[in-house]
Interface confidence: low
């Protein structure tokens, strides 16, 4: 999906009002310095691409993020403010339902959510320009 035509300001508002708090809740009990940020993004469409990948794609050691509150709110924000996004996610959602049955918070998941926090912060920087 090409995130170029999303309403970035609306997504930013959704992040600031709710998603950021849900990410903090998920990470509660971990030190802010515990994980190094190794994932980066260059502009807002790039950031959303990486955010979508980390939030919804299953990875080794962490297959449970999609059902978290921050993930559901992220999905809603992208569906509302990115034209045509929800249509591209129908097959992915069905696959997700089959693949994710248990909800376990692993260290890998905590690290992954820490990366997400970094990506969201970069998405929200006012100096960040669209290409």
């Amino acid at each position: 999906y090409d995130f170029t035509n999303c309403d970035f300001e609306k997504i930013k508002a959704a992040y600031l009002s709710t998603i950021s708090k849900d990410l903090i809740t998920y990470m509660s009990g971990t030190k802010s310095t515990e994980f190094n940020n190794t994932v980066s993004c260059s502009n807002r469409p790039h950031c959303l691409t990486e955010i979508q990948s980390l939030t919804f794609n299953p990875t080794a050691g962490c297959a449970s993020l999609a059902k978290e509150m921050f993930a559901m709110k992220t999905k809603a924000a992208l569906a509302i403010w990115c034209p045509g996004y929800s249509e591209t996610q129908i097959n992915a959602t069905q696959a997700m339902k089959k693949a994710r049955k248990s909800k376990v918070t692993t260290n890998k998941c905590l690290e992954q959510v820490s990366q997400l926090q970094g990506l969201w912060r970069r998405f929200n920087r006012p100096l960040l320009k669209q290409q």
């Epitope: 980066s40 790039h46 990486e50 080794a60 690290e111 992954q112 290409q131």
Partner: antibody, heavy 121, light 112 residues
């Protein structure tokens, strides 16, 4: 045309200082992470330092930490490398490079022509 | 720190013949996001390096399809299906999984 042009190289004595500059054009400079890479005469490539697009994160190789400072001015489309306490082993061609962004995984997709720094007495 | 090791050091190839360069990392370059942070560059004689392949197997813009990258985890390969005269130079692999980023020592490719 996407272009990176380095300047500021030259001959300097051990212990001396030099400031390298890189002028970027043909792309939205503020969207990209930037990196300095060097190559000693007849040797391979060595990563020196990287700076993220909004200067939020800065990284250095151990060999230059505490002596070199990377900085950028997004308003002027310029990247700099301040080199202090220079040593003979810092002699190299220094390349200004562009990080390819999230899709390219931090690979360096644009390189300048390079500028020679010679540290010798 | 991650150490990158390339083999062979040099390679002499007949035009039209295939060539293969190996790159090994001291630890896995696979990130939890599913991407593997390994890239290939070519430095032609007297020129600056240029990006050939990023994230193991993706050809950079303008790179001919005779170049291909493969591998996973710690073992990677750059293949040239049919070497041409313009392919001479030194090939480098690089990891950007974590700082300090690091390059392999290089493989010099020349024409027989």
């Amino acid at each position: 045309e996407v272009q990176l042009v380095e300047s500021g190289g030259g001959l300097v004595q051990p212990g001396g200082s030099l400031r390298l500059s890189c002028a970027a054009s043909g792309f939205t400079f503020s969207n990209y992470d930037m990196t300095w890479v060097r190559q000693a005469p007849g040797k391979g490539l060595e990563w020196v330092s990287s700076i993220t697009f909004a200067s939020s994160y800065i990284y250095y190789a151990d060999s230059v930490k505490g002596r070199f400072t990377i900085s950028r001015d997004n308003a002027k489309n310029s990247l700099s490398l301040q080199m202090n306490s220079l040593r003979a082993e810092d002699t190299a061609v220094y390349y200004c490079t562009r990080g390819g962004g999230a899709y390219h995984g931090g690979s360096l997709d644009v390189w300048g022509q390079g500028v020679l720094v010679t540290v010798s007495s | 720190d991650i150490v990158m090791t390339q083999t062979p050091l040099s390679l002499s190839v007949t035009p039209g013949e295939p060539a293969s360069i190996s790159c090994r990392s001291s630890q896995s370059l696979l990130h939890i996001n599913g991407y593997t942070y390994l890239h290939w560059y070519l430095q032609k004689p007297g020129q600056s390096p240029q990006l050939l392949i990023y994230l193991v197997s993706h050809r950079a813009s303008g790179v001919p399809d005779r170049f291909s990258g493969s591998g996973s985890d710690t073992d990677f390969t750059l293949k040239i299906s049919r070497v041409e005269a313009e392919d001479v130079g030194v090939y480098y692999c690089e990891q950007t999984l974590q700082t300090p980023y690091s390059f392999g020592g290089g493989t010099k490719v020349e024409i027989k």
